[in-house]
């Protein structure tokens, strides 16, 4: 089939980085500057993406692959192929249309992007809170209250294991 296709369509022999030039009797010509073809058999080369302004060049365009952009520090990429730049926030914040706002009590965000998420509810797993949550960090769940030694509060770590044969003081 490939052999048949080649006989029918001389353009199928043109490799990536070239195009099948109809103006030159279907000879494979190299892509002109600032253009590329990422697959063989192309009749035209695509124009390279230009990373302008706040879009910075992460990878230069070559004859076989498009340029890749990222965003200036302070912003991060969104969308296919970094089609948008969205502002970063600090940990403990989320982005709203009013800008970066602190996470509400009971929620956290440990990244520069994304939304504030509720703290883990330790009691749903029958566990206690070992370390309280903050705007930047989730709670740390510890053993279940029943596993704690008598008198221990839910926010303190369990007492160290005792040697066999010793009774509590």
């Amino acid at each position: 089939f490939e052999r048949t296709r080649s006989l029918q369509d001389p353009c199928s022999n043109c490799p990536a980085g070239t195009f099948c030039d109809n103006n030159r009797n279907q000879i494979c010509s190299p892509c002109p500057p600032n253009s590329f073809s990422s697959a063989g058999g192309q009749r035209t080369c695509d124009i390279c993406r230009q990373c302008k302004g706040v879009f910075r060049t992460r990878k230069e365009c070559s004859s076989t692959s498009n340029a890749e952009c990222d965003c200036t520090p302070g912003f991060h990429c969104l969308g296919a192929g970094c089609s948008m730049c969205e502002q970063d926030c600090k940990q403990g914040q989320e982005l709203t249309k009013k800008g970066c706002k602190d996470c509400c009590f009971g929620t956290f965000n440990d990244q520069k992007r994304g939304i504030c998420r509720p703290w883990t509810n330790c009691s749903l797993d029958g566990k206690s809170v070992l370390v309280n949550g903050t705007k930047e960090r989730d709670v740390v769940c510890g053993p279940s209250p029943a596993d704690l030694s008598p008198g221990a509060s839910s926010v303190t770590p369990p007492a160290p294991a005792r040697e066999p044969g010793h009774s509590p003081q």
């Epitope: 706040v54 969104l78 969308g79 089609s83 948008m84 730049c85 969205e86 709203t96 249309k97």
Partner: nanobody
Framework: EVQLVESGGGLVQPGGSLRLSCAAS????????MNWARQAPGKELEWVAN????????YYVDSVEGRFTISRDNANNSLYLQMNSLRAEDTAVYYC????????????????WGLGTTVTVSS
């Protein structure tokens, strides 16, 4: 071609005022949120202000609240930033940016940016 072109930057003394303009072309301006962002020398890019499609919602970063005013003229495809009581720390390249489709709902990404206009506040 979709394009944003800023103008109006320059040198101004502390306490002075400037009005930046952004001319939009190649897209339906009135259907997009629009933004201003800035990058001070040696600092990260910072969002400054945004405005919704009809100008009824406007938001600002805390550091410019009460001093800067964002506005738009949909009939003339123009965005503005009136900057009053300017300070040395407002020195930056100011960028106009279009909110992408879904801005304010699913994300706050900006997909079209101008090349910027430079504001220098110095005595």
């Amino acid at each position: 071609e979709v394009q944003l072109v800023e103008s109006g930057g320059g040198l101004v003394q502390p306490g002075g005022s400037l009005r930046l303009s952004c001319a939009a072309s190649g897209f339906t301006f009135s259907t997009h949120w629009m933004n201003w962002a800035r990058q001070a020398p040696g600092k990260e890019l910072e969002w400054v202000a945004n405005i919704n499609q009809d100008g009824s919602e406007k938001y600002y970063v805390d550091s410019v609240e009460g001093r800067f005013t964002i506005s738009r003229d949909n009939a003339n495809n123009s965005l503005y930033l009136q900057m009053n009581s300017l300070r040395a720390e407002d020195t930056a390249v100011y960028y106009c940016a279009r909110g992408g489709v879904g801005y304010g709902d699913s994300h706050f990404g900006m997909d079209v940016w101008g090349l910027g206009t430079t504001v220098t506040v110095s005595s």
